[in-house]
C-alpha cells in the first residue's frame, strides 16, 4: 500500500501542487521502473481509477487533464502496467489542493476584556480559502516604535504584560497562504480605550402587584470601572422587535430596573455595557426569561430558569437556542 511512497518514477502537477480552485490542471506521471516498458499508465484520484482525459506523451510519461478542478483536496497516484507483472506497479503519489488566495483582512478589532489580562484581536478573514492560511498580527508601539509579531490561524490573545511600549499602538494583520498574501489597514488603539467591562448578568426578576403591576429586573457586574453605560433590551418571546432602555450605571450595588409590562406574557431580557464614551460593547448577556403574572406577585431567579409555570411563586425558563432574532454578541 501507499503508506510510505518509495517512488519508481515521478508525479508532478502543473501549474502547481496547490492551485487556484476552478483552474484547469495537468498531472504528469513518469515511470522509472527497472526492466519495465509500461504497457499502460493509470491515474487514481482518492483511490478511484481515472478513465478519461489521459494522454500518453511518450513511452514512460502520461498526462491526466482536469478541467475546472473544484475539489479542495485529492490524493493522486499513478501506476504502470508492466509486461510479466501480474499487479500494477506503483510509480508515485501526491496530495493536491485547490483554494483561493486570502482576502484583505478587514474589521480588525482589539479589545481587553476586564480581568482577562489579554488584548484579544479579531478580524474578518473574508471568503473561505480552503487551504492552510496563516495570519501574522503586527503590534507596533507608537511611543517606542518597537514592533511585535504574532502568528496564528484565527484570532490572537496577547498578554497585556507583553505590551510594554506605552498605551498607544498600531495593529495590522497580514494573511498569507500558498496562493497569495494580503495586508489589512492599520488600526490605531489606546489601551485605555478598548477595555470592555466585566460581564453584566441579570440575576432575578420580580413583579410587584401594585395598582399598575411593576416588574423589577435585578442585575449586576463585577466591574471596577466607575463610569459605565448599559443597555437592557426586552421583548415578549412572541415578538421580533426589541425594546431598549439605556442606563448610566454605578456598580457599587446591584442594579434595579423597573418595567411596566403586559400581564400573563413571557418576556426575555438581555443586558450589555460599555465604559462610558468608549467604542466597544460587551456581547449581550445570556437570555433571561420572566413571565408576568395574571394578578399574583411573582419572583424569577437566575437559579430557577427552567420551563415550569405554577400559580403563586412561579419560575421562568432559560434556553439560549430558542429565539430567531439577533442574539449575536456584537462588540462593535
Amino acid at each position: 500500500g501507499i503508506t510510505n511512497i518509495n517512488c519508481s518514477g515521478h508525479i508532478w502537477v502543473e501549474p502547481a501542487t496547490i492551485f487556484k480552485m476552478g483552474m484547469n490542471i495537468s498531472i504528469y506521471c513518469q515511470a522509472a521502473i527497472k526492466n519495465c516498458q509500461p504497457r499502460k499508465l493509470h491515474f487514481y484520484k482518492n483511490g478511484i481509477k481515472e478513465r478519461f482525459q489521459i494522454t500518453r506523451i511518450n513511452k514512460t510519461t502520461a498526462r491526466l487533464w482536469y478541467k475546472n478542478f473544484l475539489e479542495p483536496h485529492a490524493s493522486m497516484y499513478c501506476t504502470a502496467e508492466c509486461p510479466k507483472h501480474f499487479q500494477e506497479t506503483l510509480i508515485c503519489g501526491k496530495d493536491i489542493s485547490s483554494g483561493y488566495p486570502p482576502d484583505i483582512p478587514d474589521e480588525v478589532t482589539c479589545v481587553i476584556y476586564e480581568y482577562s489580562g489579554n488584548m484579544t484581536c479579531t478580524w474578518n478573514a473574508g471568503k473561505l480559502t480552503y487551504i492552510d492560511t496563516k495570519y501574522v498580527v503586527h503590534v507596533k508601539s507608537l511611543e517606542t516604535e518597537e514592533e511585535q509579531q504574532y502568528l496564528t490561524s484565527s484570532y490572537i490573545n496577547i498578554s497585556t504584560d507583553s505590551l510594554q511600549g506605552g498605551k498607544k499602538y498600531l495593529v495590522w494583520v497580514q494573511a498569507a497562504n500558498a496562493l497569495g498574501m494580503e495586508e489589512s489597514k492599520q488600526l490605531q488603539i489606546h489601551l485605555d480605550d478598548i477595555v470592555i467591562p466585566s460581564a453584566a448578568v441579570i440575576s432575578r426578576a420580580e413583579t410587584i402587584n401594585a395598582t399598575v403591576p411593576k416588574t423589577i429586573i435585578y442585575w449586576d457586574s463585577q466591574t471596577t470601572i466607575e463610569k459605565v453605560s448599559c443597555e437592557m433590551r426586552y421583548k415578549a418571546t412572541t415578538n421580533q422587535t426589541w425594546n431598549v432602555k439605556e442606563f448610566d450605571t454605578n456598580f457599587t450595588y446591584v442594579q434595579q430596573s423597573e418595567f411596566y409590562l403586559e400581564p400573563n406574557i413571557k418576556y426575555v431580557f438581555q443586558v450589555r455595557c460599555q465604559e462610558t464614551g468608549k467604542r466597544y460593547w460587551q456581547p449581550w448577556s445570556s437570555l433571561f426569561f420572566h413571565k408576568t403574572p395574571e394578578t399574583v406577585p411573582q419572583v424569577t431567579s437566575k437559579a430557577f430558569q427552567h420551563d415550569t409555570w405554577n400559580s403563586g411563586l412561579t419560575v421562568a425558563s432559560i434556553s439560549t437556542g430558542h429565539l430567531t432574532s439577533d442574539n449575536r454578541g456584537d462588540i462593535g
Partner: nanobody, 119 residues
Framework: EVQLVESGGGLVQPGGSLTLSCVAS????????MGWFRQAPGKEREFVAA????????VYAASVKGRFTISRDNAKNTVYLGMKSLKPEDTAVYVC????????????WGQGTQVTVSS
C-alpha cells in the same frame, strides 16, 4: 443500492488509538473501492484512505500516512480504519464511502462516526 454503517468512533487522548468499522450491505459486488473520508467542523470533506480490490490495494492521504491503516474483510463485507498516534487535528466526523472505477467516483456514503482527539 449499497448501505454503509460506520461504528467505533469516540473520544480518545492525543497519541491514542482507535479502530473504525464500516459494514456494507446490499449490492456490494458493485463496489471495487471502499474509502474513508473525514470532515472537521467548518472544513471541507477530505480523503483519508481507500482500499481497492484491484491494482494498488491501499492508498492514504499524506496527513495520515504511517499512522492510519485501512483493511478489508470481504467475508464480513467490512472495511476497517486503524488509527494510531492520533492528534487533535484528526478530530472530525469519519465517513465511509463505496465507489467504483466504472462510475468514476464514490457513489454511496455512510452517515459518519465522530472521532474526538482531546486531553
Amino acid at each position: 443500492e449499497v448501505q454503509l454503517v460506520e461504528s467505533g468512533g469516540g473520544l480518545v487522548q492525543p497519541g491514542g488509538s482507535l479502530t473504525l468499522s464500516c459494514v456494507a450491505s446490499g449490492r456490494t459486488f458493485s463496489t471495487d473501492v471502499m474509502g474513508w473520508f473525514r470532515q472537521a467542523p467548518g472544513k471541507e470533506r477530505e480523503f483519508v484512505a481507500a482500499h481497492r480490490t484491484s491494482g494498488i490495494s491501499t492508498v492514504y492521504a499524506a496527513s495520515v500516512k504511517g499512522r492510519f491503516t485501512i483493511s478489508r474483510d470481504n467475508a464480513k463485507n467490512t472495511v476497517y480504519l486503524g488509527m494510531k498516534s492520533l492528534k487533535p487535528e484528526d478530530t472530525a466526523v469519519y465517513v465511509c464511502a463505496a465507489g467504483s472505477d466504472a462510475s468514476g467516483g464514490y457513489d454511496y456514503w455512510g452517515q459518519g462516526t465522530q472521532v474526538t482527539v482531546s486531553s
